[in-house]
């Protein structure tokens, strides 16, 4: 059947369309075009007599028409009269004629929009806009954009004039936005460029920083005011109600208590002719004298005499503190307080008292410290001690003694043999002794501001020394929870006395350790691993005293259970596997892996690279100590799965 | 299969130094220690020490103490033992030799053998 | 050091023959043993680990035993190609110590 198709079928002003004819019949003597939908001669475009390849305008024809020899026609240029229906008018040879209706529309090519506003500064909580698409357009379509962004949902907003008029009620800050508007028909769309909603707001209740409102004298006050507000408000600061300055900072140097008072901001927007004002109360507080410690005693003896310590200056209505140490006053009864707190007694001082004193004082900002005093407590000398503590001495040696007694001032020191003085220093050296150096030996200590004096004794034997003691075992490496190792301390020697130190302590109480043979024979029953320590016998006579070197007990032990690592147990196909064991044992255990039960190397570490589903099963690690006769083992699952179906565990090492 | 391939002999005079390699193929170089044994000709065999190839760390023989440094290179699975201050006494075939597991096991796999001659 | 003294230092004996070496240590080894054959001009190789455990691949005419400090390597029927020189050695710990060796021929 013949039919039109108009290409396009929306047309714009100026383009041009194509008519194409379909199915086209065979054998045809010519055709014509007519404007409308039906075959009128006064509305003739053009003719075709395809014979003679002649076209013949009609009264329709205004020259922007062009016909093919396939029956299609062009119309340039096109213009809004063109809009409507075609009808083509087609004679065949056997003269039947044929009639087929196409048409199109046209459309103006859209200009570039533009917005139109009742309202450029509206004021925000207040004040409508409306804005309006220009120009107004047969057959357009209007669309609206705010921020890009196709228009939001809103009880304030309203669409009217088929969708030209956008009307934003009581504007907020927030509708500070771009708009756009958008125009559309079927051959085109065009978008306005931006309209920037600027609206009108504030101020909003101004802030006063810093948030202090607790200042020491001397100190700077710089308060600074910020209020939200469009356009920016402008600032002006009262103090106590007096107007200051115009500016959003103020600044004032060295206050003193006089600047206290209350302080306003007031923010002006000059556009919505709106004030708000915040008000911060500041309080100066005065700078207190730097405190001092006076002492009705700067050198007090030990016990007998008392120390007031006083904190000066004496102000009225002023909190003192006190510290001993940095520390607050410990309770002690030898400590007293003034009822104002500005006088510390310390009654009969000790050693113990020098302190440092400070003290303080509180105002309504902070505590102000004192320097800090320490008292010279004059005390001692205590008993001398005579060093070192040795008694027994084998001839040939060398005689070094060193005496000190805890005094202030120090001590000056005298020695006496059997009773004679010998020198007044604090060190007694006699060199390459003999037993007629035997004898007692004297240290005297004397305090020359107390007046005091103490002495001790020491008797000092010159003879020939014990052996060396050695230490035999009858196991040098006992296996734990099993064997019991006898440890003798030899020589055996009369009138000795055996002594035992583990590892530099004497012997713990055990039921494990028994000491037998006169103390000469220490033995530990059923060894632990922590017995392995370092055993010291020492063998000791009325003249002299000795201690062997240490014998290290070595416990086998182990193995433990052993521990893989790392954790994981599922992996990811294509990683390392690398696993680790490990087992406390003594001597270091021999290490197997199986896999699956297949025996694999004598290795800590198994590693195998770019692992597969092929290599799940179980790893076990053996561990084994030939010493102990013990082995132990431990079995850990891998599960391989192929990539990307990893339950999001470890992908290997 | 594991192998571990020893640098060729070498001559020395008495007081220099010699640096015998052994490249090690077959297995993963870092999971077992690599010993160095000694045999003078016709005697028996000496123990030096031993590298841990994953850590560096090294054990040596008190009798070689201060004069042996084993090192390894892990990129290209060699190890390196230096013996300086070489005397008559250490013309040897000096072995390295992989234990055949980790902790108190002996040793599976050897060198070759490098022949060290010390003469003046 | 500990020592490692094995006997006889040398042994002549007939195919088909029971031969054994000992082994003793100056300290008890809790059988930490380990026994190689170095034949003539070729690098040693490890026999028996553990005291007892043969090494894959190694016939078992070989065998080892002991405990503490006496150690044993027996070749049950002795074979031309076991012509070599066969040592102990403790691996207990470092440093390790080998014995002075066992020379083994065919009469």
């Known amino acids: 059947k013949l039919t039109i198709e108009s290409t396009p079928f929306n047309v714009a002003e100026g383009k041009e369309v194509l008519l194409l004819v379909h199915n086209l019949p065979q054998h045809l003597f010519g055709y014509s075009w007519y404007k409308g939908e039906r075959v009128d001669g006064n509305r003739q475009i053009i003719g075709y007599v395809i014979g003679t390849q002649q076209a013949t305008p009609g009264p329709a024809y205004s020259g922007r028409e062009i016909i093919y020899p396939n029956a299609s026609l062009l119309i340039q240029n096109i213009i809004q009269n063109d809009t409507g229906f075609y009808t083509l008018h087609v004679i065949k040879s056997d003269l039947v004629n044929e009639e087929a209706t196409g048409q199109f529309r046209v459309y103006p090519e859209l200009p570039k929009p533009s917005i139109s506003s009742n309202n450029s500064k509206p004021v925000e909580d207040k004040d409508a806009v409306a804005f309006t698409c220009e120009p107004e357009t047969q057959d357009a379509t209007y669309l609206w954009w705010v921020n890009n962004q196709s228009l939001p949902v809103s009880p304030r907003l309203q669409l009217s004039n088929g969708n030209r008029t956008l009307t934003l009620f009581n504007v907020t800050r927030n509708d500070t936005a771009s708009y756009k508007c958008e125009t559309q028909n079927p051959v085109s769309a065009r978008r306005s460029d931006s309209v920037i909603l600027n609206v009108l707001y504030g101020p909003d209740a101004p802030t006063i920083s810093p948030l202090n409102t607790s200042y020491r004298s001397g100190e700077n006050l710089n308060l600074s005011c910020h209020a939200a507000s469009n356009p920016p408000a402008q600032y002006s600061w009262f103090v106590n109600g007096t107007f200051q300055q115009s500016t959003q900072e103020l600044f004032i140097p060295n206050i003193t208590v006089n600047n206290s008072g209350s302080y306003t901001c007031q923010a002006h927007n000059s556009d919505t002719g709106l004030n708000r004002t915040t008000v911060t109360t500041i309080t100066v507080y005065a700078e207190p004298p730097k405190p001092f410690i006076t002492s009705n005693n700067s050198n007090p003896v030990e016990d007998e005499d008392a120390v007031a310590l006083t904190c000066e200056p004496e102000i009225q209505n002023t909190t003192y503190l006190w510290w001993v140490n940095n520390q607050s006053l410990p309770v002690s009864p030898r400590l007293q307080l003034s009822n104002d707190n500005r006088t510390l007694t310390l009654l009969s001082v000790t050693r113990n008292d020098v302190g440092p004193y400070e003290c303080g004082i509180q105002n309504e900002l902070s505590v102000d410290h004192s320097d800090p005093v320490i008292l010279n407590v004059l005390y001692g000398p205590d008993d001398p001690t005579i060093s070192p503590s040795y008694t027994y001495y084998r001839p040939g040696v060398n005689l070094s003694l060193s005496c000190h007694a805890a005094s202030n001032p120090p001590a000056q020191y005298s020695w006496l043999i059997d009773g004679n003085i010998q020198q007044h220093t604090q060190e007694l050296f006699i060199s390459n002794i003999t037993e007629k150096n035997s004898g007692l030996y004297t240290c005297q200590a004397n305090n020359s501001a107390s007046g005091h004096s103490r002495t001790t004794v020491k008797t000092i034997t010159v003879s020939a020394e014990l052996p060396k003691p050695s230490i035999s075992s009858n196991n040098s490496k006992p296996v734990e929870d099993k064997d019991a190792v006898a440890f003798t301390c030899e020589p055996e020697a009369q009138n000795t006395t055996y002594l035992w130190w583990v590892n530099g302590q004497s012997l713990p109480v055990s039921p494990r350790l028994q000491l037998s043979n006169g103390n000469r024979t220490l033995t530990l029953f059923n060894v632990t691993r922590n017995d392995a320590r370092a055993y010291v016998c020492g063998i000791q006579n009325s003249v002299s005293a000795n201690r062997s070197d240490p014998v290290t007990l070595d416990v086998l032990y182990g193995p433990d259970t052993p521990i893989i690592s790392p954790p994981d147990s599922s992996y990811l196909s294509g990683a390392n596997l690398n696993l680790s064991c490990h087992s406390a044992s003594n001597p270091s255990p021999q290490y197997s892996w199986r896999i699956n039960g297949i025996p694999q190397q004598h290795t800590q570490v198994l590693f195998i690279a770019k692992i597969t589903p092929n290599n799940n099963g179980t790893y076990a690690c053996f561990v084994s100590n030939l010493a102990t006769g013990r082995n132990n083992s431990i079995v850990k699952s891998i599960t391989v799965s192929a990539s990307g179906t990893s339950p999001g565990l470890s992908a290997g090492a | 299969q594991v192998q571990l391939v020893q640098s060729g002999a070498e001559v020395k005079k008495p007081g220099a130094s010699v640096k015998v390699s052994c490249k090690a193929s077959g297995y993963i170089f870092t999971s077992y220690w690599l010993h160095w044994v000694r045999q003078a000709p016709g005697q028996g065999l000496e123990w030096i020490g031993y590298i841990n190839p994953q850590t560096g760390y090294t054990s040596y023989a008190q009798k070689f103490q201060g004069r042996v440094t084993m090192t390894r290179d892990t990129s290209t699975s060699t190890v390196y033992m230096e013996l300086s201050s070489l005397r008559s006494e250490d013309t040897a075939v000096y072995y390295c030799?992989?234990?055949?597991?980790?902790?108190?096991?002996?040793?599976?796999?050897w060198g070759q053998g490098t022949l060290v001659t010390v003469s003046s | 050091d500990i020592q490692m003294t094995q006997s006889p230092s040398s042994l002549s004996a007939s195919v088909g023959d029971r031969v054994t070496i000992t082994c003793r240590a100056s300290e008890n080894q809790y059988g930490y043993l380990a026994w190689y054959q170095q034949k003539p001009g070729k690098v040693p190789k490890l026999l028996i680990y553990n005291t007892k455990n043969l090494v894959e691949g190694v016939p078992s005419r070989f065998s080892g035993s002991g405990s503490g400090t006496d150690f044993t390597l027996t070749i049950s029927s002795l074979q031309p190609e076991d012509v070599a020189t066969y040592y102990c050695?403790?691996?207990?710990?470092?440093?390790?110590?080998f014995g002075q060796g066992t020379k083994v021929e065919i009469k």
């Open positions: 030799a992989r234990e055949y597991g980790n902790y108190n096991y002996p040793l599976d796999y």
């Open positions: 050695q403790h691996h207990l710990g470092t440093p390790y110590t």
